[in-house]
């Protein structure tokens, strides 16, 4: 159903990393506008993008109001210029998005390796702490405080003289390895959800080596 | 467990009024829509109105618009259905049902008659 | 108003028989269909939404596929407690949603 001239918007997609997140359809509009609406369960549903061209929303605002909920988004179509238009059931033509939990489904975001300090054979590696835009009291929380025990930080470190990678996990954002003395070493990290069943690592770090700019060196 | 149960149906004449509840537990009320679906007898199912979780938005059939008034109270975790002006044809089972974005119905109540008859 | 058919209207079938049972929309409802199943006088219950995605607690055997105006519920092998009456209802004209007449299963 639908009104003349107007397609129902296809391939909706939620893009979502580190809770930042993006509705995008197909297709290109001719001769047509979108408003997008989103809800959780409750049916209470918000209108975002308001009669755009664009073929993609920002629903970040929404959706870190409670990132446990389950979201629907749904694309709307109307004919340019006539936007009171509706089809045959006295709805303006529209289609659903897949679900989407963001707590579940974010892209974890490629995690940065903020310091490393040696102190003899030992080697605190630390993972800066992310910025998430979910809200609390004000302030932007950290991806340690939206999942808190839930991430996990996996290490891949090895001695830049040969390629035999060791690995280590933490719950924090702080390693702390033991390493032999005299040698360098490199580092990348990932941040993994071991509860999920989608999404579960991110990509690795860029890579950071011992006798660069970030590591702090103690010969005890 | 999610438990909806039904109340307030019985016997009345044309033109009269009854008021369905519909008390709900073992889930969050206020995150979910509600809707009513009846059933006439030995017919199938027929969506009557449905309520967003906030109350803020309803929907009717067109059969009952203007007739019948659906509401919620978040505090108490109930679903009202208010049934004015009421006609032989509404002679149906009533079931409260739990629906996500208020598209499907994922839970039902065991359904409450309401029978219409001079 | 969008219309769902269901056929076919009863259907007699044995234990362990496979049983697939069709609903197809006046118009195309993308994925936007849910199945349920209803014994005499007790509630319907829902099996089935957005087509092919099983509700929580509902044994494998039950299964939905479909899209655009066809759809199909199958029963991979029939146990004594299917017997029942099954609906398809539509959600993709929301708020008018439309359910199927029905499709009573019985025992040969």
């Known amino acids: 159903s639908g009104t003349t001239n107007t397609v129902a918007a296809y391939n909706l997609t939620w893009k979502s990393t580190n809770f930042k997140t993006i509705l995008e359809w197909e297709p290109k509009p001719v001769n047509q506008v979108y408003t997008v609406q989103i809800s959780t369960k409750s049916g209470d549903w918000k209108s975002k993008c308001f009669y755009t061209t664009d073929t993609e929303c920002d629903l970040t605002d929404e959706i870190v109001k409670d990132v446990k909920q389950t979201y629907l988004a749904r694309v709307f179509s109307y004919p340019a210029g006539n936007v009171e238009s509706t089809g045959s059931a006295g709805e303006p033509l529209y289609e659903n998005s897949p679900e989407f939990t963001p707590y579940l489904e974010t892209n974890l975001g490629q995690p940065t390796i903020q310091s490393f300090e040696q102190v003899g054979t030992k080697v605190n590696v630390t993972v800066e702490d992310e910025r998430t835009l979910v809200r609390r009291n004000n302030t932007f929380l950290s991806l340690r405080d939206v999942f808190g025990k839930d991430l996990i930080y996996t290490l891949y470190y090895w001695k830049s003289s040969s390629s035999g990678k060791k690995t280590a996990k933490t719950n924090t954002n702080e390693f702390l390895i033991d390493v032999d003395k005299g040698e360098n070493y490199c580092f990348s990290v990932q941040a993994v959800i071991p509860s999920r069943t989608v999404n579960r690592k991110s990509t690795d770090s860029p890579v950071e080596c011992m006798g660069q700019e970030k590591g702090e060196f103690r010969e005890i | 467990e999610v438990q909806l149960l039904e109340s307030g149906g019985g016997l009345v004449q044309p033109g009269g009024s009854l008021r369905l509840s519909c008390a709900a537990s073992g889930f969050t009320f206020s995150n979910y829509a509600m809707s009513w679906v009846r059933q006439a007898p030995a017919k199938g199912l027929d969506w009557v109105s449905g309520?967003?979780?906030?109350?803020?938005?309803?929907y009717y059939a067109d059969s009952v618009k203007g007739r019948f008034t659906i509401s919620r109270d978040n505090s108490k975790d109930t679903l009202y259905l208010q049934m004015n002006s009421l006609r032989a044809e509404d002679t149906a089972v009533y079931f409260c049902a739990k629906t996500p974005w208020g598209y499907y119905f994922d839970y039902w109540g065991q359904g409450i008659l309401v029978a219409v008859s001079s | 108003d969008i219309q769902m058919t269901q056929s076919p209207s009863s259907l007699s079938a044995s234990v362990g028989d496979r049983v697939t049972i069709t609903c197809r929309a006046s118009q195309g409802i993308s994925s936007w269909l849910a199945w349920y199943q209803q014994k005499p006088e007790k509630a319907p219950k829902s099996l089935i939404y957005a087509a092919s995605s099983l509700q929580s607690g509902v044994p494998s055997r039950f299964s939905g596929s479909g899209s655009g105006t066809d759809f199909t519920l199958t029963i991979s092998s029939l146990q004594p407690e299917d017997f029942a009456t099954y609906y398809c209802?539509?959600?993709?004209?929301?708020?008018?949603?439309?359910f199927g007449q029905g499709t009573k299963l019985e025992i040969k």
């Open positions: 209802q539509q959600y993709n004209s929301y708020p008018l949603y439309t």
């Open positions: 309520i967003s979780g906030s109350g803020v938005t309803t």
